[in-house]
């Protein structure tokens, strides 16, 4: 079943997907599509990489991480309710039926009208190149410390940790960072 991620209308959504290149520079094509992963390719492609660059994208979709080291996590800018649904991250490993496929469910919630939250510590300044996902409300930020290369088996662990709301609350309350790996 799909792993679920949440974002509010108007926020940026973050859908994690990682692989470890077999050797430095041995990148493989990756596609992101709207809808569950089909047998081949991605349906309704929103972004695609080749062995070197992002070579196709549609507006509002980009890779903010170091995709040349295997961080092919998708950022969707300024989401609307229409962005809800299943997204497919497909690591297109050469060979017959070798692809790794991940279905991620994005749930978009209407924006809450809340008083201006107290200013949070600027994690990005403290930890450059960190990955941040917006959680259940404007004051909640789940933050992952500088991620090393993550192999394919670790992604489900990462996904489970990310979707655990108690973890999100702990992160918010303690200002902690998680180091995976």
């Amino acid at each position: 079943s799909e792993v679920e991620y949440r974002a509010e209308v108007g926020q940026n959504a973050y859908l994690p997907c990682f692989y470890t290149p077999a050797a430095p520079g041995n990148l493989v094509p990756v596609c992101w599509g709207k809808g569950a992963c089909p047998v081949f390719e991605c349906g309704n492609v929103v972004l695609r990489t080749d062995e070197r660059d992002v070579n196709y994208w549609t507006s509002r979709y980009w890779l903010n991480g170091d995709f040349r080291k295997g961080d092919v996590s998708l950022t969707i800018e300024n989401v609307t309710l229409a962005d809800s649904g299943i997204y497919c991250c497909r690591i297109q490993i050469p060979g017959i039926m070798n692809d790794e496929k991940f279905n991620l469910k994005l749930v978009i919630k209407p924006a809450k009208v809340t008083p201006a939250p107290t200013r949070q510590r600027d994690f990005t300044a403290a930890f450059p190149r960190m990955l941040t996902t917006r959680g259940h409300g404007p004051a909640e930020t789940q933050t992952l410390g500088s991620l090393p290369d993550i192999n394919l088996t670790q992604i489900s662990t990462l996904a489970n940790e990310l979707r655990d709301s108690r973890l999100a609350n702990d992160l918010r309350d303690s200002g902690a960072t998680i180091r995976i790996g």
Epitope: P24, R52, N55, N64, D66
Partner: antibody
Framework: QVQLVQSGAEVKKPGASVKVSCKAS????????MDWVRQAPGQGLEWLGY????????SYNQKFKGRVTMTTDKSTSTAYMELRSLRSDDTAVYYC?????????????WGQGTTVTVSS | DIVMTQSQKFMSTSVGDRVSITCKAS??????VAWYQQKPGQSPKLLIY???NRYTGVPDRFTGSGSGTDFTLTISNMQSEDLADYFC?????????FGGGTKLEIK
């Protein structure tokens, strides 16, 4: 040391083709991409595309697709860029440049440039 | 295609100045921006890649910063040999694109 040595200046008529060569030395030719970039007189830089000698894979700027072909000769560590159906606005200095994973596919060594003049 | 905009075509500087050259991408390119220096009659030279990584042999007075859409090349202690054109490049997507360049001149 790494060197990229390009062929000499060319003067061509509109509609003709030009083929520029770039001989590489001082590194393993097949381990790096070869990008091609041009610069019109007094202007900025424009990327034409790249070739990966190891696999022969190419990626071209859509603006030039159908007019540009990039090839390599691994036996002589030479890359070639052919541009067809030349127009006056193709007048520029054409550069080959090496790029590799270590520098995130930015261009760390450049040829000296080949001036291509298109004039009737 | 991603458009890279260097809004200042020319900048007047003096030796010893701190100079900041800016570049704006039309969409987020993460950290995938490089900076090149080009002197008259010469080929471009790589200074900075992946936004802030100084290329081998580049003096440490050259510093790159920024991410997303806004990037800056800073020369902390301008030298006469730094008079040149400076180009930013996004190396995120194909086709790779360059800014129009910023020429440093002496006041």
């Amino acid at each position: 040391q790494v060197q990229l040595v390009q062929s000499g200046a060319e003067v061509k008529k509109p509609g003709a083709s030009v083929k520029v060569s770039c001989k590489a030395s001082g590194y393993t030719f097949t381990d790096y991409y070869m990008d091609w970039v041009r610069q019109a007189p007094g202007q900025g830089l424009e990327w034409l595309g790249y070739i990966y000698p190891n696999k022969g894979g190419t990626s071209y700027n859509q603006k030039f697709k159908g007019r540009v072909t990039m090839t390599t000769d691994k036996s002589t560590s030479t890359a070639y860029m052919e541009l067809r159906s030349l127009r006056s606005d193709d007048t520029a200095v054409y550069y080959c440049a090496r790029s590799g994973y270590g520098n995130y596919y930015t261009m760390d060594y450049w040829g000296q440039g080949t001036t291509v003049t298109v004039s009737s | 295609d991603i458009v890279m905009t260097q809004s200042q075509k020319f900048m007047s500087t003096s030796v010893g100045d701190r100079v900041s050259i800016t570049c704006k991408a039309s969409q987020s390119v993460g950290n995938n921006v490089a900076w090149y220096q080009q002197k008259p009659g010469q080929s471009p030279k790589l200074l900075i890649y992946y936004a802030s990584n100084r290329y081998t042999g580049v003096p440490d007075r050259f510093t790159g910063s920024g991410s997303g859409t806004d990037f800056t090349l800073t020369i902390s202690n301008m030298q006469s040999e730094d008079l040149a054109d400076y180009f930013c490049q996004q190396h995120y997507s194909s086709p790779s694109t360059f800014g129009g360049g910023t020429k440093l001149e002496i006041k």
